[in-house]
């Protein structure tokens, strides 16, 4: 039950996170005009990854797309790439995790397959979240660098007679959305990886069998598997509750392939 809850919660958190990454990527307010210590202008500038906008006090807003690809700063291109990679990985992760959900039955999919898919989606979410956090952080670093450069050169004048105000930009709402969304996707991915450990069959029904060189005897574990005889693995046996009791005869137990995940 806890595994299903962890997996479900991980999925929901990742879903919210990826929705946030998509929202942040599409938002226009990655950088906004710094209004602190600035002459009071009736025009407010803000920029996104895809276009820059100007909102006038009249209420009129004008946005212009970046129609050039080669003319854009390499850093902006890198941020775009990171965010898109994050979205793509996240979307694939979501698709995989839907089929991996314990509460959803698809044919006769085994728990081991679901565990693998959960782990895969978890890793994808982690990488997706890291991509988003990296993208937003690179952009934020770019803003900080430009901010201090323009602060040092706040007014460029012609002989001190005519002053030109240089617009400074600070962190926009999209950066905070991106950081939070990336963090949520990362947390969701970690939760999926944790859920994967619980999903994997920790031990197989071989554990219920004790092996003797001499004979073909059967050992019963109290409350464990219904005993299966000999070396034959009976995959249809269901584990009800493993009381953890071990008989003196129980010499060897074969680990599941998922014990080391």
């Amino acid at each position: 039950m806890a595994v299903t809850a962890c997996q479900g919660l991980g999925f929901v958190v990742s879903l919210i996170g990826i929705a946030g990454i998509i929202a942040a990527t599409c938002m226009d307010q990655w950088s906004t005009q710094d209004l602190y210590n600035n002459p009071v202008t009736a025009v407010f500038n803000y920029q996104g990854l895809w276009r820059s906008c100007v909102r006038e006090s009249s209420g009129f807003t004008e946005c212009r797309g970046y129609f050039t690809l080669l003319g854009l700063p390499a850093m902006l291109q890198a941020v775009r790439a990171l965010m898109i990679v994050g979205i793509v990985l996240g979307a694939i992760g979501l698709l995989v995790s839907i089929f991996a959900l314990k509460c959803i039955r698809i044919g006769s999919m085994e728990d081991s397959a679901k565990a693998n898919m959960t782990l895969t989606s978890g890793i994808m979410f982690i990488v997706s979240g890291l991509c988003a956090i990296a993208g937003v952080s690179v952009f934020a670093n770019m803003l900080v660098t430009n901010f201090w450069m323009s602060t040092a050169n706040m007014y460029t004048g012609m002989g001190g007679m005519v002053q030109t105000v240089q617009t400074r930009y600070t962190f926009g709402a999209a950066l905070f959305v991106g950081w939070v969304a990336g963090g949520l996707t990362l947390i969701g991915g970690v939760m999926m990886c944790i859920a994967c450990r619980g999903l994997a069959p920790e031990e197989t029904n071989y554990k219920a069998v004790s092996y003797h060189a001499s004979g073909h005897s059967v050992a019963y574990k109290p409350g464990g598997f219904k005993a299966s005889t000999g070396f034959g693995s009976n995959t249809k046996n269901k584990k009800i509750y493993d009381g953890g009791a071990r008989t003196e005869d129980e010499v060897q137990s074969y680990p599941s392939k998922h014990d080391y995940v």
């Epitope: 005009q33 002459p39 009071v40 202008t41 009736a42 025009v43 500038n45 803000y46 920029q47 820059s52 906008c53 100007v54 006038e56 006090s57 009249s58 209420g59 009129f60 004008e62 212009r64 005519v162 002053q163 030109t164 105000v165 240089q166 617009t167």
Partner: antibody, heavy 118, light 113 residues
Framework: QIQLVQSGPELKKPGETVKISCKAS????????MNWVKQAPGKGLKWMGW????????TYADDFKGRFAFSSETSARTAYLQINNLKNEGMATYFC???????????WGQGTLVTVSS | DIVMTQYPSFLTVTTGEKVTMSCKSS????????????LTWYQQKPGQPPKLLIY???TRESGVPDRFAGSGSGTDFTLTISSVQAEDLAIYYC?????????FGSGTKLEVK
């Protein structure tokens, strides 16, 4: 079509209060700011400030802080300019003007002449 | 406050003549975000409210005859009337629409002979 109709001329004594109205029609009132411009007889235009008709927030030019107040009534689609404690230099024509692209003022009221005389 | 200086104060021209008037601002009115200059030109005829001619320094308002043209960038702006008509007799004002307060220039009075 878009129209701004202002209240009629006012004759006031120094120290009195005057309230000028500007009724808008032909557009969504709260979508655009309303500016107020003063023109003293034979003088140039002086921008007094503007009111954000959506939020009710006002911005005043330094010379018009204190005795001047902008307000608006959305239901009546009307903006108001109130001048308290009128002085002789308050005698002027007051225009309301709606803002648009480039913060320009394409639509103007006909003006309200305020005469201050003792 | 931004100071808007208009010159000349008076202009006397004959019908059909080309006329140019200037407006200079104490600070640049160019917004880097959209590369637009926030300067507006108005025409005011006696006894009438001002009429918008040009916004964003060079964009003609709809319904304004194409003989009116605005130009300039940063701090120096010009309004040109390519062929003055008798009805152009008016005072022309420039206005800063970038910095608060939105100051007007003192105006250029155009008289037609």
């Amino acid at each position: 079509q878009i129209q701004l109709v202002q209240s009629g001329p006012e004759l006031k004594k120094p120290g009195e209060t005057v309230k000028i109205s500007c009724k808008a029609s032909g557009y969504t009132f709260t979508n655009y700011g309303m500016n107020w411009v003063k023109q003293a007889p034979g003088k140039g235009l002086k921008w007094m400030g503007w009111i954000n008709t959506y939020t009710g927030e006002s911005t005043y030019a330094d010379d018009f802080k204190g005795r001047f107040a902008f307000s608006s009534e959305t239901s009546a689609r009307t903006a108001y300019l109130q001048i308290n404690n009128l002085k002789n230099e308050g005698m002027a024509t007051y225009f309301c003007a709606r803002s648009y692209n480039g913060n320009s003022l394409p639509y103007w009221g006909q003006g309200t002449l305020v005469t201050v005389s003792s | 406050d931004i100071v808007m200086t208009q010159y000349p104060s008076f202009l006397t021209v004959t019908t059909g003549e080309k006329v140019t008037m200037s407006c200079k601002s104490s600070q640049s009115l160019l917004n880097s975000g959209n590369q637009r200059n926030y300067l507006t030109w108005y025409q005011q005829k006696p006894g009438q409210p001002p009429k918008l001619l040009i916004y964003w320094a060079s964009t003609r308002e709809s319904g304004v005859p194409d003989r009116f043209a605005g130009s300039g960038s940063g701090t120096d702006f010009t309004l040109t009337i390519s062929s003055v008509q008798a009805e152009d007799l008016a005072i022309y004002y420039c206005q800063n629409n970038y910095f608060y307060p939105f100051t007007f220039g003192s105006g250029t009075k155009l008289e037609v002979k």
